[in-house]
């Protein structure tokens, strides 16, 4: 709950805020969780703590790890965790999914793309914007404060947008880039990171020994037919076909449905004649498309049959 994922690129600045909030007067101590070593506050260090902020100036791949922040007040202590991952710069232009911030949608009336995390930094204009790695040029694009405005949005404006700015710390400049996808709402189709509607994460499903049971994996991927999108089941991290238990079968083919205009896929897992050993297995509902993979885990528990006394 009080853990936050943060990421950045090597040799760029990264500033992380403690997920636990407190008054400015409260002191915040930062530690590297693996070693419980205190993070220094002296600004001469490459990695240092500055109140609620943890600063990597610049970041290195070796900085990856979990950092603990403790907000101390006269009456309580609050602990938060920052899970930091620093990636190597890609040699090609394509931005991998794990470096992408949340997708934003726009329409003809509202086409603001905010530069993610920029509020944490001491930056000065101009903010540079790139689409699919190419610098944006033309009067339709306006860099305004911390966001980009696109005039007369068209379907072809959908894409991956990167903002680039300079963070200044005590006279030293550090580069920062952040990328997010932009989709145009009124286009015929758009794609989302898969959203699993069922089962709920870590759901416990009650089954009766000796009876049949069905589990449905259902996920939505966006609007319109989705390219290379799929839902499937795994048993203990293995494909159903490779698991080798003939009683447990995945329905052939995926059923396509539409929910609130979104394209969704269902896959039913059928377990015949449920046995005790089935309760020990981990059942994973997987949904994937070109954006990435989402997984929800289900476990089975024995449903106690109601005793009927004559």
């Amino acid at each position: 709950k009080f853990s936050k994922q943060s990421w950045g690129l090597e040799n760029e600045a990264l500033i992380v805020r403690c997920p636990r909030q407190g008054k400015p007067s409260y002191t915040v101590d930062w530690y590297y969780s693996q070693t419980n070593k205190s993070i220094p506050t002296q600004e001469r260090n490459r990695v240092f703590a500055s109140g609620q902020l943890l600063k990597f100036l610049p970041a290195a791949v070796a900085d990856s790890g979990i950092y603990t922040c403790i907000v101390r007040s006269p009456t309580f202590n609050r602990t938060g965790y920052a899970n930091v991952t620093i990636y190597k710069k890609q040699s090609d232009c394509n931005v991998p999914d794990y470096l992408m911030y949340s997708t934003v949608s726009g329409s003809e009336k509202n086409s603001k793309i905010y530069c993610p995390t920029i509020d944490l930094y001491n930056w000065t204009a101009p903010l540079e914007w790139f689409k699919n790695c190419q610098a944006l040029q033309g009067s339709r694009y306006r860099a305004h404060k911390s966001f980009l405005v696109i005039d007369n949005v068209m379907t072809e404006d959908a894409g991956d947008y990167t903002c680039k700015f300079i963070h200044n710390e005590n006279g030293a400049n550090y580069s920062v880039t952040a990328t997010r996808s932009f989709t145009v709402k009124d286009e015929q189709g758009f794609s989302l990171f898969p959203v699993i509607g069922a089962p709920a994460q870590n759901e416990i499903k009650e089954v009766e020994i000796g009876k049949n049971a069905n589990l449905t994996c259902s996920a939505c991927f966006g609007k319109g037919t989705q390219f290379l999108a799929a839902v499937l089941w795994q048993l203990n991290g293995t494909k159903i076909t490779d698991f080798g238990e003939p009683r447990i079968q995945q329905e052939e083919g995926q059923n396509q449905s539409f929910s609130n205009g979104l394209a969704c896929l269902d896959m039913v897992l059928r377990i015949a004649d449920v046995k005790e050993e089935d309760l020990l297995l981990q059942y994973d509902c997987l949904a994937l498309n070109l954006h990435g993979l989402r997984r929800h885990t289900v476990r089975l528990s024995r449903k106690n049959p109601i005793d009927h006394h004559s």
């Epitope: 932009f182 286009e187 319109g224």
Partner: antibody
Amino acid sequence: EVQLLESGGGLVKPGGSLRLSCAASGFTFSSYWMSWVRQAPGKGLEWVSAISGTAINTYYADSVKGRFTISRDDSKNTLYLQMNSLKTEDTAVYYCARVRRDSSGGGAFDIWGQGTMVTVSS
Amino acid sequence: DIQMTQSPSSLSASVGDRVTITCRASQGISNNLNWYQQKPGKAPKLLIYAASSLQTGVPSRFSGSGSGTDFTLTISSLQPEDFATYYCQQSYSTPPTFGQGTKVEIK
């Protein structure tokens, strides 16, 4: 430099088997869906198969389903295509290609190998 | 499966000409269309993705447009190195399908 290099093509008799390999370099191989596309002599391009970045899911063209198997070894940055029960109509140059996502949900084959020739003939 | 039809199948043009190739899908495919260039004995090369986005490193004389079922690839001023075969490909649904190709030859 981003590169894909196929190998394993050759002459095989109908009903025979062949395994194609595609060595990737210059990018984070495990992050990408990969595909095989073929081109019969003097003909157009035909998509054959695709595999997700986690090797969790695979897709096949109807013409090869049940005969071809796509796989990958992310530790070796290598994509494979196992071709069994080969037919004369499988004769083609086989290309491996990287799939790049676009934000509207589609994908393009943005990096291609140089291709390897597979000839099925008695 | 979605059928992709290109026209013309071949065309003759001179250096400096403006060349237009069209691609029609058998059903609406939004903007999920890509264009490739292939020279004899070489692998295809991505030119345009998502109907109108220019792939990095591709000259700006290439442009793409269209949405739904009708798409166009335009070469504003044909250069000697542009004589090749061009393919469209839809990525709206699986399986991805290609057009039959358009060969651009020297007049």
